[in-house]
């Protein structure tokens, strides 16, 4: 199972639920569904309040039980380390895969943290991060922002991923904007 890590804004916008949490306990495999279940302790929720309704405390995250079908394997054994988890809700349960955005909170830049907590949501409705995988590539719409990080280096390590968000400049037009300048 291979997938290109998304721009964090894309991960935020395409996810039903975005939380900060610690992985605690030993993973378990459900012997009916064959899904692996990680116990988590949620510390913050950034997206999903409406989707969750009253069940605002997520205690488990679910993933396929095998790597080849995109199961997520949590490698850290540090139970006090916080992770940003962006996943999908299925039957009220948080699901993630290898392709989901799961990253140690401490590994995120200050700009990315600002994005997840406040800014990415502003670009979700109107703007699209458009991956540029090979040259030449051109904008297909004024609401697209060309994401070129993959051309230069690992997509999640690039400047646009770590410091920029695709946000509305005016109706029908989105541009890359610095998250740094927005950090209070």
């Amino acid at each position: 199972c291979t997938c290109v890590p998304p721009h964090p804004q894309t991960a935020f916008c395409n996810s039903d639920l975005v939380i900060r949490a610690k992985f605690v306990g030993t993973p378990e495999v459900n012997q009916t569904t064959l899904y692996q279940r990680y116990e988590i302790k949620m510390t913050k929720m950034y997206k999903g309040f409406q989707a969750l309704g009253d069940a605002a405390d997520i205690r488990f995250v679910y993933t396929p039980a095998m790597e080849s079908v995109c199961g997520y394997f949590h490698r850290s054994h540090n139970r006090s380390e916080e992770f940003l988890i962006a996943g999908k809700l299925q039957d009220g349960l948080l699901h993630i895969t290898t392709c989901s955005f799961v990253a140690p909170w401490n590994s995120l830049s200050l700009a990315q943290r600002r994005g997840f907590t406040k800014t990415y949501t502003v670009g979700c409705e109107e703007c699209t991060v458009f991956p540029c995988l090979s040259i030449p590539c051109k904008l297909q719409s004024g609401t697209h922002c060309l994401w070129t990080d993959q051309l230069l280096q690992g997509s999640e390590k690039g400047f646009q991923s770590r410091h920029l968000a695709c946000l509305p400049r005016e109706p029908g037009l989105c541009t890359w904007q610095s998250l740094r300048s927005q950090i209070a």
Partner: antibody
Framework: QVQLVESGGGLVQPGGSLRLSCAAS????????MSWVRQAPGKGLEWVSA????????YYADSVKGRFTISRDNSKNTLYLQMNSLRAEDTAVYYC??????WGQGTLVTVSS | DIALTQPASVSGSPGQSITISCTGT?????????VSWYQQHPGKAPKLMIY???NRPSGVSNRFSGSKSGNTASLTISGLQAEDEADYYC??????????FGGGTKLTVLG
Amino acid sequence: QVQLVESGGGLVQPGGSLRLSCAASGFTFSSYAMSWVRQAPGKGLEWVSAISGSGGSTYYADSVKGRFTISRDNSKNTLYLQMNSLRAEDTAVYYCARFFDYWGQGTLVTVSS
Amino acid sequence: DIALTQPASVSGSPGQSITISCTGTSSDVGGYNYVSWYQQHPGKAPKLMIYDVSNRPSGVSNRFSGSKSGNTASLTISGLQAEDEADYYCQSYDFVRFMVFGGGTKLTVLG
């Protein structure tokens, strides 16, 4: 009591196909993931494939991926293994297992020309 | 392609205790509490003796016990009896290969 009975084994030529069945009784079939495990003559056990209770998730060993297909019919309490492009190294006793607690007695598949 | 390492053979006299080891990695034995042990007599299907590292199914003698330390699981049989002579296989959940087995250990009861 829990019972698993395999059938469908036999002699088949290399490149041929075979479909194994496993009739289950004595438990709520749809509540359990099921697996196929095989054992070549004089050798150890090798996991082949698994399927979730609903049939929505299927997993395969690398050695059979793309050639074997696991499926189930919960209305008939039956598990299946469709085996295509069979090779000599697929020769084994094939066991059906209720996610590794109860096992059937096995059915022998021989791939030979 | 044996994933878990077991001794090829062990032996003991009636009444003695023996232990069979099963060594894996942190992605199988060490990472999960899903280790099972099976007993297989010649020409028979495997029979579950221990599941989830140390649990015994009903009907299995309490002479059989399981444990785990790090990446190694162990099956101990106390008060060895003639009918214990069989092949024993360990099995673990593994994230990459889903289910993996040991190569099997032939237990011989002497005398």
